[in-house]
C-alpha cells in the first residue's frame, strides 16, 4: 500500500461542501498533514495544514482535522465555487518530498 491514499476524483457543485478524507499508515501519525493546490508550473501551494496554517483563500471556510487513532485526516471545504476546481495533493511531512496523493476536485 502507498503511504497515503484518498479519493482520486471528487465531484461536487457550487455552494456545496466537501469532506476529503486522506488515509495514512500508523508510522506517519506524527507527521505534518497538509492539503495543497498544484500549480501550472509544478509546484504545490499549501492551503491548509495540521500545524494551524490556513491560506487567505480558505479563511473561514476550510479546516483540517487529524485523527491519528484512525490513521486519517479530513479536509473540509465549504462554499465551493468553480474557482476551487483543480488538482490538489493531500500529503505528509514537507511538501514535494513524495509522501502525497493527487486529488482532482471538480466543481
Amino acid at each position: 500500500k502507498s503511504p497515503i491514499f484518498g479519493p482520486e476524483e471528487v465531484n461536487s457543485v457550487e455552494g456545496n461542501s466537501v469532506s476529503i478524507t486522506c488515509y495514512y499508515g500508523p508510522q506517519y501519525a506524527s507527521y505534518r498533514k497538509y492539503w495543497c493546490r498544484q500549480g501550472a508550473r509544478g509546484g504545490c501551494i499549501t492551503l491548509i495544514s495540521s500545524e494551524g496554517y490556513v491560506s487567505s483563500k480558505y479563511a473561514g471556510r476550510a479546516n483540517l482535522t487529524n485523527f491519528p487513532e484512525n490513521g486519517t485526516f479530513v479536509v473540509n471545504i465549504a462554499q465551493l465555487s468553480q474557482d476551487d476546481s483543480g488538482r490538489y495533493k493531500c500529503g505528509l511531512g514537507i511538501n514535494s518530498r513524495g509522501l502525497s496523493f493527487d486529488v482532482s476536485l471538480e466543481v
Partner: nanobody, 127 residues
Framework: EVQVVESGGGLVQAGGSLKLACAAP????????MGWFRQAPGQEREFVAA???????????YYADSVKGRSTISRDNAKNTVYLQMNSLKPEDTAVYYC?????????????????WGQGTQVTVSS
C-alpha cells in the same frame, strides 16, 4: 438477506473494454459506499475502485494504482446500481470481479469493512 448482483463480465481481447454493473435492490443505496474488488486465480482478493456519495451531490471516487487512468467507477442512485467501466484491458486484468457494499467509511481498500458481497462476474482478457 440483502444481496448485490454483478453482471457484464465476459471474454475480451487485450486493449478492449468492458462495463461491469452491480445492482443492489435491497440496499438503502445512497447511504452506502460501493466498491469493486477482483481475485485472480491463486491470488488474494484486491481492491479495484470505490465510490461514495454524500447525499447532497458530491461524489468521491477511489482507484487502485493498477487500474488508475483505465477505469471509471460511477453510480446511479435512482437505479441502485454501480458501474465499472474498464478500458485498455490487459491479460493481467483477468479475474473474478466482485461488487461490495459498506456503510463503514474507513479506508476503502480494506476488504473486511465491506459487509455485503456479490457472487462475482468473470472477466477474461486474452492476448
Amino acid at each position: 438477506e440483502v444481496q448485490v448482483v454483478e453482471s457484464g463480465g465476459g471474454l475480451v481481447q487485450a486493449g478492449g473494454s468492458l462495463k461491469l454493473a452491480c445492482a443492489a435492490p435491497g440496499l438503502t443505496f445512497s447511504s452506502y459506499r460501493m466498491g469493486w474488488f477482483r481475485q485472480a486465480p491463486g491470488q488474494e482478493r484486491e481492491f479495484v475502485a470505490a465510490i461514495d456519495w454524500n447525499g447532497r451531490g458530491t461524489y468521491y471516487r477511489y482507484y487502485a494504482d493498477s487500474v488508475k487512468g483505465r477505469s471509471t467507477i460511477s453510480r446511479d442512485n435512482a437505479k441502485n446500481t454501480v458501474y465499472l467501466q474498464m478500458n485498455s484491458l490487459k491479460p493481467e486484468d483477468t479475474a473474478v470481479y466482485y461488487c461490495a457494499a459498506t456503510t463503514v467509511l474507513t479506508d476503502p481498500r480494506v476488504l473486511n469493512e465491506y459487509a455485503t458481497w456479490g457472487q462475482g462476474t468473470q472477466v477474461t482478457v486474452s492476448s
